[in-house]
């Protein structure tokens, strides 16, 4: 069954003083001729129970739609059960399989049982309640005080394992699996085990700041990134393989940095700046991707204006220092007292002393 | 971080009982339930049971069901599991896990004997 | 309840080696399945959850595939440190069901 529940009668106590049935007869044969009293025997008594839909005025037949039962014989005119609470022979247990509709009738009969295939049983006292009663563990007493016995008894509905609300219709079993990382509150609501979420908690809360986008996660605090994408929260695209000063928006892109051109952007859009590979004042320029071009001062030649043309034309050596041209400009050879690139330290200044013999001679660029 | 420590294992007699206590600490115990995992002596791992969180629901192997009792006590951050009638064949290691991701959590174990 | 059951349940392997455990179960667990690795004396330790996925710390030559009924645990190139006992386990539903364990041993 879908639902789970069940109502529950125990039958309390019987004053049955004179051990008479309803229609006034003795239970155990005939009367006492003088007190009126039914010595022969005692009733030998038991009770039915029908439970049906509500009725506001109650009808004896019809179906017991909502289940019948009955106990066995379970004591004489008069007794008194109250302490052997829970003893089975007096109670009676209709379980059932829809959602419980909180109002009922409930039919109470106590009958003699005549022990005899032919004699059949016979009534002694009914009862017949209609109310609304919600599922609790608490029982509620009624009573049985007109007529020729008095009777008493509880009932109560019950919700099977598992079950809760006033209809015992709704279901929560805690579980810890595939299906659900819960518990269950006192009303049947599923309280998720910290890390899960989710009408059935069975979605795992994934690392704090984990891409909802591009991150993902079976296992609580964690953060799969989708293909294409990677970090602590999944939040960074990976780009194109190979890319050298590049990013990326988009998966697998690579938008160059400032400067930098090409599929891979690793071409030098600016060369001149980063390298500065003009020499001997000369001016670059920017002609193309990992390419560039020099313009170089007068007397300077060379793709980086490396080579001096007539270096010696502008008499760089002084002091007269003579003057000889060389691949990469020119070179100076000084007279004595006197060196440097250009002869123009004075060998005295220097080290504070003369020297003798020929002078330095030094490259220039 | 994360631990679990059990304790409370040694010998005891068939028919006996004994209390394994799962002392956890590094998470917010009432928010996850434990389960409790035995390994006899050169065999594989046997699930035994596990409680909720708030303590209010256990469930149980076949073969512990109605001798073993598995409670909690959240003011200790404490599980246990009370072995009554105990059988040679209850004769593992103890462990218990944190339930609520897999078992990515365990204890370290406590060795239970029974015999006479 | 569900059962799992390992193969093999021993095998010998070197060092470098590429190494498979399968398991099966008795009905269709979905992905729930997970793997753990126990050395002797030790806990369990959880390599490999909702059959593929690699826990935390551990590392990249463990893989686990599969769904339904038939998983896999291999490690790409055998290192010294993973010679021990391998469990499958199903957390498809209560009760959570091992499988009898693989023991991987030095060749």
């Known amino acids: 069954a879908d639902l789970g529940s069940q109502f529950e009668l125990e039958i309390l106590s019987m004053q049955n003083v004179n051990g008479e049935l309803q229609n006034g007869n003795c239970c155990g044969g005939v009367r006492n001729p003088g007190d009126r009293k039914c010595t022969r025997d005692e009733c030998d008594t038991y009770f039915k129970v029908c439970l049906k839909e509500y009725q506001s005025r109650v009808t004896a037949g019809g179906p017991c739609s909502f289940g019948s039962g009955s106990t066995p014989v379970i004591g004489g005119n008069t007794f008194n059960l109250k302490a052997s609470r829970g003893n089975d022979r007096n109670r009676i247990v209709l379980p059932f399989s829809f959602a419980w509709p909180r109002s009922y009738t409930l039919l109470v009969e106590a009958w003699d049982s005549s022990n005899d295939t032919i004699q059949p049983d016979s009534i002694i006292e009914k009862a017949s309640h209609s109310g609304m009663i919600n599922p609790s563990r608490q029982w509620q007493t009624l009573k049985q005080n007109t007529g020729i016995a008095h009777f008493e008894y509880q009932i109560r509905v019950t919700c099977d394992d598992h079950y809760y609300g006033f209809g015992c219709n709704k279901f929560c079993r805690p579980r810890d699996d595939f299906f659900g990382h819960y518990a269950c509150d006192q009303n049947g609501n599923k309280t998720c085990m910290e890390g899960w979420m989710g009408p059935d908690c069975n979605k795992a809360i994934c690392r704090q700041g984990c891409s909802p986008k591009h991150g993902s996660c079976k296992l609580p605090g964690d953060c799969r990134c989708q293909y294409g994408w990677q970090g602590l929260y999944c939040d960074k695209c990976i780009p194109h393989p190979g890319c050298v000063h590049g990013t990326c928006n988009e998966p697998w892109q690579c938008l160059c940095e400032t400067n930098w051109g090409g599929q891979l952007c690793d071409k030098d859009l600016n060369y001149c700046g980063t390298h500065q590979p003009c020499l001997n004042r000369g001016t670059c320029s920017n002609t193309g991707p990992d390419k560039y071009q020099c313009s170089c001062p007068e007397g300077y030649s060379g793709p980086n204006c490396e080579i001096a043309e007539h270096a010696c034309l502008s008499d760089p050596c002084h002091n007269r220092g003579s003057c000889k041209e060389t691949s990469s400009g020119f070179e100076c050879e000084c007279s004595p007292g006197w060196t440097g690139p250009t002869c123009s330290t004075n060998i005295d200044d220097e080290f504070g002393l003369v020297p003798r013999g020929s002078g330095h001679h030094h490259h220039h660029h | 971080e994360v631990q679990l420590v059990e304790s409370g294992g040694g010998l005891v007699q068939p028919g006996g009982s004994l209390r394994l206590s799962c002392a956890a600490s590094g998470f917010t115990f009432s928010n996850y339930g434990i389960h409790w995992v035995r390994q006899a002596p050169g065999k594989g791992l046997e699930w035994v049971g596990w409680?909720?969180?708030?303590?209010?629901?256990?469930d149980y192997a076949d073969s512990v069901k109605g001798r073993f009792t598995i409670s909690a006590d959240t003011s200790k951050n404490t599980a246990y599991l009370q072995m009554n009638s105990l059988r040679a064949e209850d004769t593992a290691v103890y462990y218990c896990?944190?339930?609520?991701?897999?078992?990515?959590?365990w204890g370290q174990g406590t060795l239970v004997t029974v015999s006479s | 309840d569900i059962q799992m059951t390992q193969s093999p349940s021993s095998l010998s392997a070197s060092v470098g080696d590429r190494v498979t455990i399968t398991c099966r179960a008795s009905q269709d667990v979905s992905t729930a399945v997970a793997w753990y690795q126990q050395k002797p004396g030790k806990a369990p330790k959880l390599l490999i959850y909702?059959?593929?996925f690699l826990y935390s710390g551990v590392p990249s030559r463990f893989s686990g595939s599969g769904s339904g009924t038939d998983f896999t645990l291999t490690i790409s190139s055998l290192q010294p440190e993973d010679f021990a006992t391998y469990y499958c386990?199903?957390?498809?539903?209560?009760?959570?069901?091992f499988g009898q364990g693989t023991k991987v041993e030095i060749k």
């Open positions: 386990q199903q957390s498809y539903t209560t009760p959570p069901t």
């Open positions: 909702s059959a593929s």
């Open positions: 896990a944190r339930a609520g991701s897999w078992f990515a959590y």
């Open positions: 409680i909720t969180p708030d303590g209010g629901y256990t």
